[in-house]
């Protein structure tokens, strides 16, 4: 609607800003234990890992930025059980990494963001 | 705890992962209208903007990654009032941009993340 009133450069800047806010996989930091649903006597070092998760804006307020495809990345972490009965174990923890995102009307029944071992 | 049992390279990778998850300003996408607390008959195009906000992990579960310093970035956006009584106006919207973060025990009474006009 605004092409008549504003110079092309301003509109280009606004459009670039908008593109960068769009629903897409974004690097984010997740807490491993809470994602895994582990009890408080099992914890991880480091407690957080970096993965890609869907985020950003949709064109309509009624839509939610959701993952449509997921891969699982293996992160090497120390798993520590308290009381410490053995040496902290270096374990591969599979972390959900969102590879595709889409603006959807409702959240699917089974979101794919759970960490699997 | 693990220096004796695992090779230096593995530990280095784990440590680098941890450093990357630490509390710091991270590029994030915020919805302008909800941040501004605008009524539902005023909306913006684009509805979202990219700014830096504090995020990430702390060394203690009880600490929260909070902003300690903030700058305000001016973003050019179209402000649209519904019903459309006039031409959408190009307005400068000042958006809070976190420039410093710290893991704090409790959230300060007046967080500095509100968008100002």
């Amino acid at each position: 609607f605004a092409a008549t009133f504003y110079d092309i450069e301003t509109l280009k800047v606004i459009d670039e800003e908008w593109q960068r806010t769009q629903c897409s996989p974004r690097e984010t930091c997740v807490e491993v234990a809470s994602e895994l649903g582990k009890s408080t006597n099992t914890f991880f070092k480091p407690p957080c890992v970096n993965v890609f998760r869907c985020g950003g804006c949709c064109n309509e307020e009624s839509l939610i930025c959701m993952n449509t495809s997921t891969s699982y990345i293996s992160k090497q972490l120390f798993e520590i059980s308290v009381p410490l009965t053995s040496v902290p174990e270096l374990v591969p923890v599979k972390v959900a990494n969102h590879t595709g995102c889409k603006c959807l009307p409702t959240a699917p029944r089974h979101p794919y963001s759970i960490i699997r071992r | 705890f693990a220096a004796t049992f695992y090779d230096i390279e593995t530990l280095k990778v784990i440590d680098e992962e941890w450093q990357r998850t630490q509390c710091s300003p991270r590029e994030t996408c915020v919805e302008v209208a909800s941040e501004l607390g605008k009524s539902t008959n005023t909306f913006f195009k684009p509805p979202c903007v990219n700014v830096f906000r504090c995020g990430g992990c702390c060394n203690e579960e009880s600490l929260i990654c909070m902003n300690t310093s903030t700058s305000y970035i001016s973003k050019q956006l179209f402000e649209i009032s519904v019903p459309l009584t006039s031409v959408p106006e190009l307005v400068p919207v000042k958006v809070a941009n976190h420039t410093g973060c710290k893991c704090l025990p409790t959230a300060p009474r007046h967080p500095y993340s509100i968008i100002r006009r």
């Epitope: 914890f43 | 941890w18 409790t106």
Partner: antibody, heavy 118, light 112 residues
Amino acid sequence: QVQLVQSGAKVKQPGASVKASCKASGYTFTGYNMYWVRQAPGQGLEWMGYIDPYSGDTTYNQKFKGRVTMTTDTSTSTAYMELRSLRSDDTAVYYCARTSYYGGMDYWGRGTLVTVAS
Amino acid sequence: DIVMTQTPLSGPVTLGQPASISCRSSQSLVHSNGNTYLHWLQQRPGQPPRLLIYKVSNRFSGVPDRFSGSGAGTDFTLKISRVEAEDVGVYYCSQSTHVPRTFGRGTKLEIK
């Protein structure tokens, strides 16, 4: 295994400063906050503050603000606590303690006895 | 500051018998994240403190299972099911929900 080795006992005059050290080993130094706690003779424990060795950020007990400075040297995995304008009631054992992600002070140094006397 | 009130302040206990220490905080220790950061420490004579229990009820590494913690909100308890000679010392509750972190005044456990 995790070890926190603290500097030896010190005797100081009132008004002077003291700097206690705490050398950490057996874990990633930057991954855990380091607390400082003191204990006057025959008394209980008093929390002085902590430092995040990764960022260098500190949080101090208001009671000691302006008198205490906590620092770290990540190259040697050593934490330091300096207390200025010493008074006789600062005579105490000063402990460093590593804090786990879940908040408990899980490993302690053996303490540095600081005696303030003229 | 959060005041941690421990009872009793001292108590002679018979070997093999149970012992219980109470700790009450002046404000709730439930953090905004839903967790409760109440911990128990033991200090044997001439030793630095040692972590026994973290987050109300989790036993730390190497702590015998005769030690247990319970409670919620503002009221917490440390129980020793059967006191042994090595349990002699002072027991402290501490909280890390609020700043400043604070400790109870300590409970001295002695053998009868």
